[in-house]
Interface confidence: medium
């Protein structure tokens, strides 16, 4: 059985400040089921940016269809980027328990951010 | 309908503790980061502390860094605030707000705790 | 640091007539500024965010303008309800969170 692969192809990001952001993450396989979650940062001090299962991420969107069957792609856009959303954000595949469990991280994305041009 | 319900509030003297809890219905609690902001008599708004939606991350005013604990229960769906070696510059109302997003303003408030420290 | 200076300190407006806020940041916030009202008493309240957007249940005679360092408050055909302590409060840079000193609207 193929270990599941969790895919961030950009190692880094920059954006001005006002600007959207996307930060790309597929999987490579749809096994074993269970949901992705975006966090800023690593470690217990990490932020929770986008979790399609609940909460409210009203500056998120998912780029392709989250809910769609087979969907292998959790791409997510940030809009109206500013300096404190800089960081390192990592797409991170769980496994469908109670409650889910973490499996796979991906190796990251680093989001700098521009001062807007004048 | 969102709310949050602070307690623990009181009377204590200078050097003492006491812990606020911050009660949170009517959303998705572990999804958002939480923070308390306080209020002293007949003055403006001053943000003290804030936690992300994990627990494992916390920001602090510099004026209680070191003597306070914002921590979290999301099982509970509770936030506290732990706050040691209290002064008289503490006396405020503590109200317990919710973050729209990890990056951004307060949309819900609490009511407000009162919190007198007095010799 | 960002600094959050608003004005007046006091606004003494008639019913019905239009009471203008001011908040001005020591460095450009972009458009991550809210403003939240404060009754006699009671908790704050969330009006406007982003700028310009108005929170769920807010009365369309509040609207915000403004980006980069200077913002306003409008509250127009003021309601004796609308007596209230104002702060502006910026998300732009943190920690810490910054919320200017506030503008307290009276009725006349």
């Known amino acids: 059985e193929e270990e599941l692969q969790v895919i961030q192809p950009e190692k880094s990001v920059s954006v001005a400040a006002g600007d959207s952001a996307t930060l790309n993450c597929t999987v490579s396989s749809l096994i074993p089921v269970g949901p992705i979650q975006w966090f800023r940062g690593a470690g217990p001090g990490r932020e929770l940016i986008y979790n399609l299962k609940e909460g409210h991420f009203p500056r998120v969107t998912a780029v392709s269809d989250p809910t769609k069957r087979n969907n292998m792609d959790f791409s997510i856009r940030i809009s109206n980027i500013t300096p404190a959303d800089a960081g390192t954000y990592y797409c991170v595949k769980f496994r469908k328990g109670s409650p889910d469990v973490e499996l796979k991280s991906g190796a990251g994305t680093e989001l700098s951010v521009r001062a807007k041009p004048s | 309908d969102v709310q949050l319900v602070e307690s623990g509030g009181g009377v204590v003297r200078p050097g003492e503790s006491l812990r606020l809890s911050c009660a949170a219905s009517?959303?998705?609690?572990?999804?958002?980061?939480m923070n308390w902001v306080r209020q002293a008599p007949g003055e403006g708004l001053e943000w003290v502390s804030r936690?992300?939606?994990?627990?494992?991350?916390?920001d602090y005013a510099e004026s209680v860094k070191g003597r306070f604990t914002i921590s979290r229960d999301n099982s509970e769906n509770t936030l506290y605030l732990q706050m040691n070696s209290l002064r008289a510059e503490d006396t405020a109302v503590y109200y317990c707000?919710?973050?729209?997003?990890?990056?951004?303003?307060?949309?819900?408030w609490g009511l407000g705790a009162l919190v007198t420290v007095s010799s | 640091e960002t600094v959050l200076t608003q004005s007046p300190a006091t606004l003494s407006v008639s019913p019905g007539e239009r009471a203008t806020l001011s908040c001005r940041a020591s460095?450009?916030?972009?458009?991550?500024l809210a403003w939240h009202q404060q009754k006699p008493g009671q908790a704050p309240r969330l009006l406007i965010y982003?700028?310009?957007n108005r929170a769920t249940g807010i009365p369309d005679r509040f609207s915000g303008s403004g980006s980069g360092t200077d913002f306003t408050l409008t509250i127009s055909g003021l309601q004796t309800e609308d007596s209230a302590v104002y702060y502006c409060?910026?998300?732009?840079?943190?920690?810490?969170?910054?919320f200017g000193g506030g503008t307290k609207v009276e009725i006349k």
């Open positions: 707000a919710k973050q729209y997003d990890w990056n951004g303003f307060f949309d819900y």
């Open positions: 009517g959303f998705s609690f572990s999804s958002y980061a």
């Open positions: 936690i992300n939606s994990g627990g494992g991350g916390t």
């Open positions: 460095q450009t916030v972009g458009s991550k």
């Open positions: 982003d700028a310009t």
């Open positions: 409060q910026q998300y732009y840079y943190w920690p810490p969170y910054r």
